[in-house]
Amino acid sequence: YDFTNCDFEKIKAAYLSTISKDLITYMSGTKSTEFNNTVSCSNRPHCLTEIQSLTFNPTAGCASLAKEMFAMKTKAALAIWCPGYSETQINATQAMKKRRKRKVTTNKCLEQVSQLQGLWRRFNRPLLKQQ
């Protein structure tokens, strides 16, 4: 999916008002310095691509983020403010229902959510030069 035509300001507002708080809640009890940011993005469409990938694609050691509150809200924001995104999710939703797993917070998941926090912060500062 190409995130170029999303309403970035409305997605940003949703992040600032609610998604960011859910990410912080998920990470509660973890030191902010515990994980190094290894995933980066260069512009808003690229950031959303990486955010989608880390949020919804199961990875080794962390298969359960998609049912978290921040993930549900991310999905809703993309469906509402990214043209044509919702139709890409119709088959994905059926597949996710079939493979629904128990939510488990592993160290790998905490690391992944820490990366997500970094990507979202970068999404909110699109004019900053990539370091």
Epitope: I80, G84, E87, I90
Partner: antibody, heavy 120, light 107 residues
Framework: QVQLVQSGDEVKKPGSSVKVSCKAS????????MHWVRQRPGQGLEWMGT????????DYNQNFKGRATITADKSTSTAYMELSSLRSEDTAVYYC?????????????WGQGTSVTVSS | EIVLTQSPGTLSLSPGERATLSCRAS??????VHWYQQKPGEAPRLLIY???QSISGIPDRFSGSGSGTDFTLTISRLESEDFAVYYC?????????FGTGTKVEIK
């Protein structure tokens, strides 16, 4: 079963406001956005805007921006649409309709409609 | 804003006949089109979503097709309860818009 029950019909004076309610039952309120659609007499359907309980935010058709306010009370699973500065051309039937925001993504259940007549 | 144009405006047919309704979008919208039926004094009822996906409880004589800018709703054999107004809707991007409507009337 899923039900959207709207408030009763209204007769209003030009320049006044109207607030229509839509009480939802039979599903998880925050899993769906609540949209508002109006239909003038003998005309087609016009999307006015939506409230997304999951994100606690609303979005509007520019044609209604500034005049329409869409809100919801999550504790009672009730959505509201207020339209101000009413004029005769706002005479219409107003519908609420739910739409999944993390699945389905379509207006699959509608309220029965609320008739609003604007007349001096 | 994406404009949806439906044709014909009115379709006069007899029960048992096949009805073909068209919906054309002003720009490509992939498969983000849904079809609704509306009878006088009633709210719209969802028939088909995402161009061709069927809804449980809707008779299988209703089917949808198309992608991009051209979409079709087909009623294979009209029953008396099918005479109504049909609207297409796009949810590709905000603001969501509806088509102009096609009235299917008894000939």
């Amino acid at each position: 079963q899923v039900q959207l029950v709207q408030s009763g019909d209204e007769v209003k004076k030009p320049g006044s406001s109207v607030k229509v309610s839509c009480k939802a039952s039979g599903y998880i309120f925050t899993d769906y956005a609540m949209h508002w659609v109006r239909q003038r007499p003998g005309q087609g359907l016009e999307w006015m805007g939506t409230f997304i309980p999951l994100l606690d935010t609303s979005d509007y058709n520019q044609n209604f921006k500034g005049r329409a306010t869409i809100t919801a009370d999550k504790s009672t699973s009730t959505a509201y649409m207020e339209l101000s500065s009413l004029r005769s051309e706002d005479t219409a039937v107003y519908y609420c309709a739910r739409m999944g925001v993390t699945h389905s993504y379509v207006m699959d259940a509608w309220g029965q409609g609320t008739s609003v007549t604007v007349s001096s | 804003e994406i404009v949806l144009t439906q044709s014909p405006g009115t379709l006069s047919l007899s029960p048992g006949e096949r009805a073909t309704l068209s919906c054309r979008a002003s720009q490509p919208i992939s498969i983000s089109v849904h079809w609704y039926q509306q009878k006088p004094g009633e709210a719209p009822r969802l028939l088909i979503y995402f161009a061709s996906q069927s809804i449980s409880g809707i008779p299988d004589r209703f089917s949808g097709s198309g992608s991009g800018t051209d979409f079709t709703l087909t009623i294979s054999r009209l029953e008396s309860e099918d005479f109504a107004v049909y609207y297409c809707q796009q949810t590709f991007s905000l603001p969501y818009t509806f088509g102009t409507g096609t009235k299917v009337e008894i000939k």
